[in-house]
């Protein structure tokens, strides 16, 4: 599944049907390049964009509407979490209900928890409305257990 990396400014199309994939972490340009041995934390995030309407264009990744919305959302998340331990996002899906957005966020393990993922997204909602003209509501964040994610032991220095 194509992925938006925190270290890249260019965006690629994301399938609306595939499940979340592991970002290719070795592409990251962080000073301490994250490797799978360090571990990755995944979070599933969904939210409503209440000022947009869902239509069939959001089921087709080749349409302008799909690509523009995906680009805005990808840029928004790169703004919210910047870099630090943010590795990228994948598996953006659009659903009916105004527009419901579902995606998976990947972070360097041990650098953030589910509460702070949600907090920082909620803190950015006002800016998202002005910068991207997206009115965001009904934010929900949950942990995604991945069997290959290294178990938390000693913390990653921050």
């Amino acid at each position: 599944t194509p992925t938006t990396l925190a270290s890249h400014s260019t965006k690629t199309d994301a399938s609306s049907t595939h499940h979340s994939s592991v970002p290719p972490l070795t592409s990251s340009n962080h000073s301490t390049s994250p490797q799978l041995s360090t571990g990755v934390s995944f979070f599933f995030l969904s939210f409503h964009i209440s000022n947009l309407q869902f239509n069939s264009s959001l089921e087709d990744p080749s349409t302008d509407y799909y690509q523009e919305l995906q680009r805005d959302i990808s840029e928004m998340f790169l703004q919210i979490y910047k870099q630090g331990g943010f590795l990228g996002l994948s598996n953006i899906k659009f659903r009916p209900g105004s527009v419901v957005v579902q995606l998976t966020l990947a972070f360097r393990e041990g650098t953030i928890n589910v509460h702070d993922v949600e907090t920082q997204f909620n803190q950015y909602k006002t800016e998202a409305a002005s910068r991207y003209n997206l009115t965001i509501s009904d934010v929900s964040v949950s942990d995604v257990p991945f069997p290959f994610s290294a178990q938390s032991g000693a913390g990653v220095p921050g």
Epitope: N29, H30, S31, T32, Q79, I80, Y81, K82, Q83, G84, G85, F86, R108, T111, I112, N113, V114, H115, D116, T119, Q120, Q123, G155, P157, G158
Partner: antibody, heavy 119, light 107 residues
Framework: QVQLVQSGAEVKKPGSSVKISCKTS????????MNWVKQRPGQGLEWIGQ????????NYNGKFKGRATLTADKSSSTAYMELSSLRSEATAVYFC????????????WGQGTLVTVSS | EILLTQSPDFQSVTPKEKVTFTCRAS??????IHWYQQKPNQSPKLLIK???ESISGVPSRFSGSGSGTDFTLTINSVESEDIADYYC?????????FGQGTKLEIK
């Protein structure tokens, strides 16, 4: 290894300004938030604000807005905090501290800079 | 603004004793609490992140627990080198805030 080295102690007169530096090494300066924390003598810790050197994005504690200005120089991997219109209450040790995100914890701290405001 | 209240303000213990510090948040913050140790004339040092996650290089006698509004930092067997101030910090909301601190003294 990650290092944050702050500038030396300053003595300033009320109403003046001071600019403190925090020179970093051992990591990609642009990719992490730099925070500033105040500690008055014998008192606790108070978060002033933060800057993301990659694009200059800043967040401030409302209490310090207008009095503290955060900047960063990517070429020298140095963060700065300027405090203006100094009053006696600004007498404190100021720390820089690195974090992964806007809201986070601080594993790396500078050694602190004592600013004394006295006439 | 989230207010963090630490108790007690001072704690006096004998070496090898178990000590517990508490931090209470003015509203629920999940597990977004972090603990620091600050020795005299030094910078704070991160001990525990996200309420209970250990930090590389920090002695195993330090542990944390709690969620919601009530959190604890425990030192299982106090050593003389643990004389310091201990602060909690929340990252659940802006502005980031710290507790007022607890001073640990050795009898």
């Amino acid at each position: 290894q990650v290092q944050l080295v702050q500038s030396g102690a300053e003595v300033k007169k009320p109403g003046s300004s001071v600019k403190i530096s925090c020179k970093t090494s051992g990591y990609a300066f642009s990719n992490f938030w730099m925070n500033w924390v105040k500690q008055r003598p014998g008192q606790g810790l108070e978060w002033i604000g933060q800057i993301y050197p990659g694009d200059g994005d800043t967040n401030y504690n409302g209490k310090f807005k207008g009095r503290a200005t955060l900047t960063a120089d990517k070429s020298s991997s140095t963060a700065y905090m300027e405090l203006s219109s100094l009053r006696s209450e600004a007498t404190a040790v100021y720390f820089c501290a690195r974090s992964y995100y806007r809201s986070a914890w601080f594993a790396y701290w500078g050694q602190g800079t004592l600013v004394t405001v006295s006439s | 603004e989230i207010l963090l209240t630490q108790s007690p303000d001072f704690q006096s213990v004998t070496p090898k004793e178990k000590v517990t510090f508490t931090c209470r948040a003015s509203q629920s913050i999940g597990t977004s609490i972090h603990w620091y140790q600050q020795k005299p004339n030094q910078s704070p040092k991160l001990l525990i992140k996200y309420a209970s996650e250990s930090i590389s290089g920090v002695p195993s006698r330090f542990s944390g627990s709690g969620s919601g509004t009530d959190f604890t930092l425990t030192i299982n067997s106090v050593e003389s080198e643990d004389i310091a101030d201990y602060y909690c910090q929340q990252s659940n909301n802006w502005p980031l805030t710290f507790g007022q601190g607890t001073k640990l003294e050795i009898k």
